[in-house]
Interface confidence: low
């Protein structure tokens, strides 16, 4: 597969992953009530996210409440907020870096420097995926630990919500996309003769040493 194709595929995966990460960050379904034996309130489900909690009745009526105070939030929610928002913003930065390093753009002149910019974009996406993975796994670990903790009352036990699964899928896309971008950039830096069209100018005159002027070669 050509470097341009790797670049395009990598960027598409990263963009989809970025969208998934934004969705996971905003959804109030990081944890959902686990119906272990019965409904604590007849036919009612509770969803909890990073920004709000929702109560869904069996009728389909949903009532959501945005968390009032940041200080009242648990450490894990505050940390998850900070890390996921950082990952989303970093992915935004990575997008511009990747576009600048893309072969189809003219932000940076073709050459090793451009390939290095593209490589940086790929690495940023990889780091972005890892950064998002931390709160997702941390949060999941807490949910699972509390689920099996006998000191947590049965009605307060939660299961992993859809947002966590979306988040994991998004991080996988970001990391795979980042790897593809890195591979595309690697091809460029490793094989410059094939990656970039080189215009040769006609030799003017031999130098005093009889060699051709080095500037005629990339």
């Amino acid at each position: 597969m050509g470097s341009a194709a790797l670049e395009i595929l990598g960027l598409v995966l990263c963009l989809v992953g970025w969208g998934g990460l934004i969705l996971a960050c905003g959804l109030p379904m990081w944890q959902v009530t686990a119906f272990l034996d019965h409904n604590i309130v007849t036919a009612q489900t509770t969803w909890k996210g990073l920004w709000m909690s929702c109560v869904v009745q069996s009728t389909g009526h949903m009532q959501c409440k945005v968390y009032d105070s940041v200080l009242a939030l648990s450490t894990e929610v505050q940390a998850a907020r900070a890390l996921t928002v950082s990952a989303v913003l970093l992915a935004f930065v990575a997008l511009f870096v990747t576009l600048a390093g893309a072969q189809c753009t003219t932000c940076v002149a073709p050459g090793p420097a451009k390939a290095r910019v593209a490589l940086t974009g790929g690495v940023l996406y990889l780091f972005c995926g890892l950064l998002a993975l931390v709160p997702l796994c941390w949060f999941a670990n807490i949910v699972v630990r509390e689920f099996y903790d006998p000191s947590v009352p049965v009605s307060q036990k939660y299961e992993l919500g859809a947002a966590l699964y979306i988040g994991w899928a998004a991080t996988a896309l970001l990391m795979v996309g980042g790897c593809l971008l890195c591979c595309g950039a690697w091809v460029c830096t490793g094989r410059p003769d094939l990656s970039f069209p080189v215009k040769y100018s006609a030799p003017r005159r031999p130098t005093a040493t009889g060699d051709y002027d080095k500037k005629n070669y990339v």
Epitope: F35, H38, I40, V41, T42, S151, P153, S155, Q156
Partner: antibody
Framework: EVQLVESGGGLVQPKGSLKLSCAAS????????MHWVRQAPGKGLEWVAR??????????YYVDSVKDRFIISRDDSQSMLYLQVNNLKTEDTAMYYC???????????WGQGTTLTVSS | DIVMSQSPSSLPVSVGQKVTMTCKSS????????????LAWYQQKPGQSPKLLIY???TRESGVPDRFTGSGSGTDFTLTISSVKAEDLAIYYC????????FGGGTRLEIK
């Protein structure tokens, strides 16, 4: 109307065994956790065992004094709750109640009880 | 394990009198996430099985007369009967359902 009817109690010798049964009706048995609670003559209530629903893999819990001797089980298709009591001791003599863990985690419905007497 | 202690063990009262019985737990029954106390009160009349009166420490079960009131939080709880009736003759048990299930020793309400 919710009904819990216990049966199977009787006179047993120490180290003996017995199986207590509870027939449930009037509610969706398979989604509720069920318990056995006992009451020794003239004494207070003591929680004995709990079994959760199928969605919780029928997880079981016991009070320390009956662990390894009593086995709680259920048959959702028949809406039946059971307590297999083995290696009985005289201190196991009590009225055994079948109890439903209700929507608020506490015990909202109780059976009338079945008497288990352990004596030589 | 959580240990539940009830006092008094016996409570002689007259019809129409207001009575209060207490229940103490060895550890807090308040779950901070939902601000609920995992404590229930049961009534057991002579020759009958227990009946749920109060859950979440202060919420009356449907059908329970409003003369029964539960209060308290954390480790200290009370059950108050505002005006005792002859039919209230029973043993009253508190129960924690925060971690597994433990009952108090009971308070016997006796009519003078």
């Amino acid at each position: 109307e919710v009904q819990l009817v216990e049966s199977g109690g009787g006179l047993v010798q120490p180290k003996g065994s017995l199986k207590l049964s509870c027939a449930a009706s009037g509610f969706t048995f398979n989604i509720y956790a069920m318990h056995w609670v006992r009451q020794a003559p003239g004494k207070g209530l003591e929680w004995v065992a709990r079994i959760r629903s199928k969605s919780s893999n029928y997880a079981t819990y016991y009070v320390d004094s009956v662990k390894d001797r009593f086995i709680i089980s259920r048959d959702d298709s028949q809406s039946m709750l059971y307590l297999q009591v083995n290696n009985l001791k005289t201190e196991d003599t009590a009225m055994y109640y079948c109890v439903r863990e209700g929507n608020w985690d506490c015990f909202d419905y109780w059976g009338q009880g079945t008497t288990l007497t352990v004596s030589s | 394990d959580i240990v539940m202690s009830q006092s008094p063990s016996s409570l002689p009262v007259s019809v129409g009198q207001k009575v209060t019985m207490t229940c103490k737990s060895s550890q807090s029954l308040l779950y901070t996430s939902n601000q609920k106390n995992y404590l229930a009160w049961y009534q057991q009349k002579p020759g009958q099985s227990p009946k749920l009166l109060i859950y979440w420490a202060s919420t009356r079960e449907s059908g329970v007369p409003d003369r029964f009131t539960g209060s308290g939080s954390g480790t200290d709880f009370t059950l108050t009967i505002s005006s005792v009736k002859a039919e209230d003759l029973a043993i009253y048990y508190c129960q924690q359902y925060y971690r597994y299930h433990t009952f108090g020793g009971g308070t016997r309400l006796e009519i003078k």
